[in-house]
């Protein structure tokens, strides 16, 4: 299976955690506008997570447009120097457990759980379906396993998972065995498949973060979320590389596709951005 055709590379300290935008306009597509001037401007690319150059026509467009690279960075990037990955033997909570619950900028609201550092408990909130931060768990149990203290005042196994043969799902284990995987890819890879609002039946793929594989689904042709790819390969490139595999001595290796990188093709227009 080509899905298993992977190489291993050491993870670096500059690897970014899932994207958290400072301003909603940073998620807008670069818009050159209807005019015909040729003006060098910069925009924030949510896929590469970098400020990039584009040619602006001189009128209209949107707020994701900056005169200089520095201005773009100032408005749309934040210091990602602090790594949020902890070694397998550390007892303290991952840093993201202390982040405020973040619904993100989209509006496909679904139930998620976050660790409330004030109450020291995992609680429910409504997640918009894209972006946000890593204090965001699909189940209460997963949140508790990663962020809540164990009965003796220390962490239960933060990332321990076991494949459940009955329903092919991942179930958290409250043991001290080092885990195999963590997810640090784009946050939309963690969102459920969303058919959207129209009536078409297009063959698409979404990343199932529970089983760690790309699976087919029927897309209606509009709406939905970013976890939506035209091919299995594209889905794997975007999401499979986000799994970080642990090795026994607490080191980290990242599973990475051998194939050439390809930019994820997603219609930004389908992101419902809310006022912030």
């Amino acid at each position: 299976d080509s899905e298993e055709d992977e190489e291993h590379t050491i993870i670096t300290d500059t690897e970014l955690p899932p994207l958290k935008l400072m301003h909603s306009f940073c998620a807008f597509k670069a818009d050159d506008g209807p005019c015909k001037a040729i003006m060098k401007r910069f925009f924030f690319n949510i896929f590469t997570r970098q400020c990039e150059e584009f040619i602006y026509g001189g009128c209209e467009g949107n707020q994701n447009r900056f005169e200089s690279l520095e201005e773009c960075k100032k408005m749309c990037t934040r210091d990602n120097a602090n790594r949020i990955i902890k070694t397998t033997l550390q007892q303290e909570k991952p840093d993201f457990c202390f982040l405020e619950e973040d619904p993100g900028i989209c509006r496909g609201y679904i139930t998620r759980y976050f660790y409330n550092n004030q109450t020291k408990q995992c609680e429910r909130f409504k997640y918009g379906g894209c972006l946000g931060n890593m204090n965001n768990f699909e189940t209460l149990e997963e949140c508790k396993n990663i962020c809540e203290d164990g009965p003796n005042g220390f962490q239960v196994d933060n990332y321990g998972t076991q494949l459940n043969a009955v329903n092919n799902s991942l179930t958290p284990q409250s043991t001290k065995v080092p885990s195999l995987f963590e997810f640090h890819g784009p946050s939309w890879c963690l969102t459920p498949a969303d058919r959207g609002l129209c009536r078409a039946n297009e063959n698409r793929f979404y990343y199932n973060s529970v089983i760690g594989k790309c699976r087919p689904f029927k897309y209606s042709g509009c709406g939905g979320n970013e976890n939506n790819f035209t091919s299995k390969q594209e889905c794997l490139r975007a999401c499979k590389k986000g799994f970080i595999q642990r090795i026994s001595k607490g080191g980290l290796i990242k599973t990475k596709r051998k194939r050439k990188k390809q930019r994820v093709k997603i219609a930004y227009e389908e992101i419902f951005v809310k006022n912030m």
């Epitope: 405020e100 619950e101 619904p103 679904i110 139930t111 109450t119 609680e123 459920p192 912030m276």
Partner: antibody, heavy 118, light 112 residues
């Protein structure tokens, strides 16, 4: 004892603005998401807006999005609702409510009446 | 948005007799996490709403056990086993499963 006390309501002309406040006591305010819900005279309840524990993120009903702004000051144990471009249909009693760990409203204030009329 | 429909809208009852209010939602209130976020509020005349029941059947602290909530999916019921004078008021069901939160129109309970 959990207490939520709203204030700031009154009579305002269409297009005008008003700022509601909700003073919270009897619980650790910063631990809870908070909401505003309104009730038009003789009518049912309508959810208006919710703000996360730290105040960085917000949710709005479509009917008020772009006109109303929810905010909070955890140091002052206070929740606010800035209402701009008010319309006659915004006339209602506005309640602040606390969200529990299930993201459900558990405690409600006594409400403050906002009347939008020329 | 999810539409919540309550019946009846008015419920005259005799003191000491049972009362039942129905609440139906336009779509299932069973969330992805396996919980059903259906709740009941009581609003006594001239007062603010007070939560009675959450997650279909859990009673809030201080709520008399003559109140019971039941149901699943789209059909829910609030029952008062023996109505007392202090139970007069408007009862609302509301859902916290889907965003935005939505409320029923309310059922006015009054003494015959």
């Amino acid at each position: 004892e959990v207490q939520l006390v709203e204030s700031g309501g009154g009579l305002v002309k269409p297009g005008g603005s008003l700022r509601l406040s909700c003073a919270a006591s009897g619980f650790t305010f910063s631990s809870y998401a908070m909401s505003w819900v309104r009730q038009a005279p003789g009518k049912g309840l309508e959810w208006v807006s919710t703000i996360t524990t730290g105040g960085s993120y917000t949710y709005y009903a479509d009917s008020v999005d772009g006109r109303f702004t929810i905010s909070r000051d955890n140091a002052k144990n206070s929740l606010y609702l800035q209402m701009n471009s008010l319309r006659a249909e915004d006339t209602a009693v506005y309640y602040c409510a606390r969200q529990d760990g299930n993201f459900l409203m558990d405690y409600w204030g006594q409400g403050t009446l906002v009347t939008v009329s020329s | 948005d999810v539409v919540m429909t309550q019946t009846p809208l008015s419920l005259p009852v005799t003191l000491g007799q049972p009362a039942s209010i129905s609440c139906k939602s336009s779509q299932s209130l069973l969330d992805l996490d396996g919980k059903t976020y259906l709740n009941w509020l009581q609003q006594r005349p001239g007062q603010s709403p007070k939560r009675l029941i959450y997650l279909v059947s859990k009673l809030d602290s201080g709520v008399p056990d003559r109140f019971t909530g039941s149901g699943s999916g789209t059909d829910f019921t609030l029952k008062i086993s023996r109505v007392e004078a202090e139970d007069v008021g408007v009862y609302y069901c509301w859902q916290g499963t889907h965003f935005p939160f939505t409320f029923g129109q309310g059922t006015k309970v009054e003494i015959k």
